[in-house]
């Protein structure tokens, strides 16, 4: 049966918490990704940014989970209107910013 949206969001938060907790060496070898506006459409925008990181097992589960939240197909090289123009940040910072935002969504009961 389908997972309730609140449970799905909690599981995504859980995964991001695991990533931040278990981070020893630089996450994804310090790879840089496009920063995004943390507004509407955050899941697709986050996926569009992170999908460009390859060969990083630490975020593969996150990529799969975000795929479940995003209603359309996302492929590498896609550019979202939510991308912050010409701003790249490390994956570790991206994950932290996303985690803060998703925890607020959970606190506010915004699951979709």
């Amino acid at each position: 049966s389908p997972v309730p949206p609140s449970t799905a969001l909690k599981e995504l938060i859980e995964e991001l918490v695991n990533i931040t907790q278990n981070q020893k060496a630089p996450l994804c070898n310090g790879s840089m990704v496009w920063s995004i506006n943390l507004t509407a459409g955050v899941y697709c925008a986050a996926l569009e940014s992170l999908i460009n990181v390859s060969g990083c097992s630490a975020i593969e589960k996150t990529q799969r989970m975000l795929n479940g939240f995003c209603p359309h197909k996302v492929s590498a090289g896609q550019f979202s209107s939510l991308r912050v123009r010409d701003t790249k940040i490390e994956v570790a910072q991206f994950v932290k910013d996303l985690l803060v935002h998703l925890k607020k969504l959970f606190r506010e009961g915004q699951f979709n």
């Epitope: 909690k10 918490v17 931040t20 943390l38 507004t39 803060v100 925890k103 607020k104 009961g109 699951f111």
Partner: antibody, heavy 125, light 112 residues
Framework: QVQLVQSGAEVKKPGSSVKVSCKAS????????MHWVRQAPGQGLEWMGT????????KYVPKFQGRVTITADESTSTAYMELSSLRSEDTAVYYC??????????????????WGQGTLVTVSS | DIVMTQSPLSLPVTPGEPASISCRSS???????????LEWYLQKPGQSPRLLIY???DRFSGVPDRFSGSGSGTDFTLKISRVEADDVGIYYC?????????FGQGTKLEIK
Amino acid sequence: QVQLVQSGAEVKKPGSSVKVSCKASGFYIKDTYMHWVRQAPGQGLEWMGTIDPANGNTKYVPKFQGRVTITADESTSTAYMELSSLRSEDTAVYYCARSIYDDYHVDDYYAMDYWGQGTLVTVSS
Amino acid sequence: DIVMTQSPLSLPVTPGEPASISCRSSQNIVHINGNTYLEWYLQKPGQSPRLLIYKISDRFSGVPDRFSGSGSGTDFTLKISRVEADDVGIYYCFQGSHVPWTFGQGTKLEIK
């Protein structure tokens, strides 16, 4: 260390406005919610509203709607509460407080864990 | 708005004795995300309030284990196992589940 430092006491005339500031240090305000709570002399605590400084979204108590404006300036790590059309019943100590997430827990408290020292606003003709 | 009703309003206690404060909400305060954002704050004379308990029963860091919270639905309790002179002040319950968030009217704990 975490600190919330509020602006000084104010004396205002009925019908005027007051703007109280709350300067944060030791954390990023965009990671938090910033709240405003007031306490009339000899009375209990009353939550007025909150802001998410990351996007400017606010929530207000209906009784203050239209009279209160909560804002935040990420660049100066400062939250503000402006109350207009002041009346004598608005005489109170106004507190700012933060609630923040925690890196290492899935289910965060987001309770008001740090408070400012309070700002006394006196409304008198 | 949800009304939070505390009892008693005044609580004289002998040092070393237990104390209990009740807080009743006018409706269920389970948040849509499944959490119950019921908190307890202590305001000592001349000071700003400080957080004691969050989410019904979780003690905030630095709060002595003499303090405990319990309850569910609409009925909540703060217990102090052995009151100390330093515990004097006004105790407030607070619900952060449904906007507008609301405080109880406060319970004044004093030493006999």
